[in-house]
Amino acid sequence: SGTTNTVAAYNLTWKSTNFKTILEWEPKPVNQVYTVQISTKSGDWKSKCFYTTDTECDLTDEIVKDVKQTYLARVFSYPAGNVESTGSAGEPLYENSPEFTPYLETNLGQPTIQSFEQVGTKVNVTVEDERTLVRRNNTFLSLRDVFGKDLIYTLYYWKSSSSGKKTAKTNTNEFLIDVDKGENYCFSVQAVIPSRTVNRKSTDSPVECMGQEKGEFREI
């Protein structure tokens, strides 16, 4: 379907990290504007970003209502200054996005090591439980609240004096690892959802090393 002098949007792409979700598309508009609609499989479409000249639309507020649903967005093109105009089929020109299931597809944001504490030859490493924009009972949920045991963290750790890495895994946000007494260690963590087929892993967190301010050390 089409409207004279308008170009259909193309390259509709979901950009989503920790459920913050933006739909992007092309082209930059010339004498046209866009409106976005989003729907679950019910086909009850909700309009967002009305008559915009942007080529992105923040759909976070819609997808966080149920992150396990599958969503589709469509971008309508209208002639600038004549948004009532429709195509020969009685509808404005539109293009569909790919399907998007936030729970299965949102990228896992880069995690942060919140703290580490050494007690003798044990070190407890804690990963920050990042807040998402998903709400329950008017409270923002953390990544762990949303994913539960589907989310694990992998810890990479190594002696500051060597390059050989060891790994540990946890389905909480804490690790308890054995270390050699008197050695300084460096740590990096990665969020992983093993059950996923796409976007399974986050990027690695910034490296934190013992002897720097994040840690607490108690020799026993």
Epitope: S1, A8, K41, S42, G43, G87, N96
Partner: antibody
Framework: EVQLLESGGGLVQPGGSLRLSCAAS????????MSWVRQAPGKGLEWVSV????????YYADSVKGRFTISRDNSKNTLYLQMNSLRAEDTAVYYC???????????WGQGTLVTVSS | EIVLTQSPGTLSLSPGERATLSCRAS???????LAWYQQKPGQAPRLLIY???SRATGIPDRFSGSGSGTDFTLTISRLEPEDFAVYYC?????????FGQGTKVEIK
């Protein structure tokens, strides 16, 4: 397992009315668009109407607009098609279909035959 | 409304051969607003492909869809005995939704 079971078909005279029903099970009914598609004997498929999950949006083929009304009762997991002012050319097998986004039809019932004849 | 024209009307092939079915729209239906269905005698249609190229649940990978805009293709890489049937394309780029007239794939 998704199941769609149509009923209400039969023989009706031109100008008469008929109400088709489609009982759905095996999925969350209110979460999906639903549609009616028909097929005249020996002919191809013809889309008739579609309704969104909430019932708030409906579309019709030009050939039935003003005569047919699609509706749904989400509490009963049932889809309906009220057919008025029936014509001989409405004779067909009527299929109920699950319609994600009101776009395409991923599960179909086995159909119910509507015959309009004097 | 958008008119879909399928070709050929009938395709006579042997099991094991490749089948290529065409669906052409009278105007653009967008890059991906097309579905393909299979129907056997006395049965309801079955969804094969949606979004022009995405296989529906449980559909064997010998079925593939391609195309965009006005020209779409359904390919069956190696015909199995159970694939002989009528195939319909359907667009959802605008309302009313419309079907092609069908292509019959018959045993040669």
């Amino acid at each position: 397992e998704v199941q769609l079971l149509e009923s209400g078909g039969g023989l009706v005279q031109p100008g008469g009315s008929l109400r088709l029903s489609c009982a759905a099970s095996g999925f969350t009914f209110s979460s999906y668009g639903m549609s009616w598609v028909r097929q005249a004997p020996g002919k191809g498929l013809e889309w008739v109407s579609v309704i969104s999950g909430s019932g708030g949006t409906t579309y019709y083929a030009d050939s039935v607009k003003g005569r047919f009304t699609i509706s749904r009762d989400n509490s009963k997991n049932t889809l309906y098609l009220q057919m008025n002012s029936l014509r001989a050319e409405d004779t067909a097998v009527y299929y109920c279909a699950k319609a994600p986004w009101t776009y395409y039809f991923d599960y179909w019932g086995q159909g119910t035959l509507v015959t309009v004849s004097s | 409304e958008i008119v879909l024209t399928q070709s050929p009307g009938t395709l006579s092939l042997s099991p094991g051969e490749r089948a290529t079915l065409s669906c052409r729209a009278s105007q653009s239906v967008g890059s991906s607003s097309l579905a393909w269905y299979q129907q056997k005698p006395g049965q309801a249609p079955r969804l094969l492909i949606y979004g022009a190229s995405s296989r529906a649940t449980g559909i064997p990978d010998r079925f593939s869809g391609s195309g965009s805009g006005t020209d779409f293709t359904l390919t069956i890489s190696r015909l199995e005995p159970e694939d002989f049937a009528v195939y319909y394309c359907q667009q959802y780029g605008s309302s009313p939704r419309t079907f092609g007239q069908g292509t019959k794939v018959e045993i040669k």
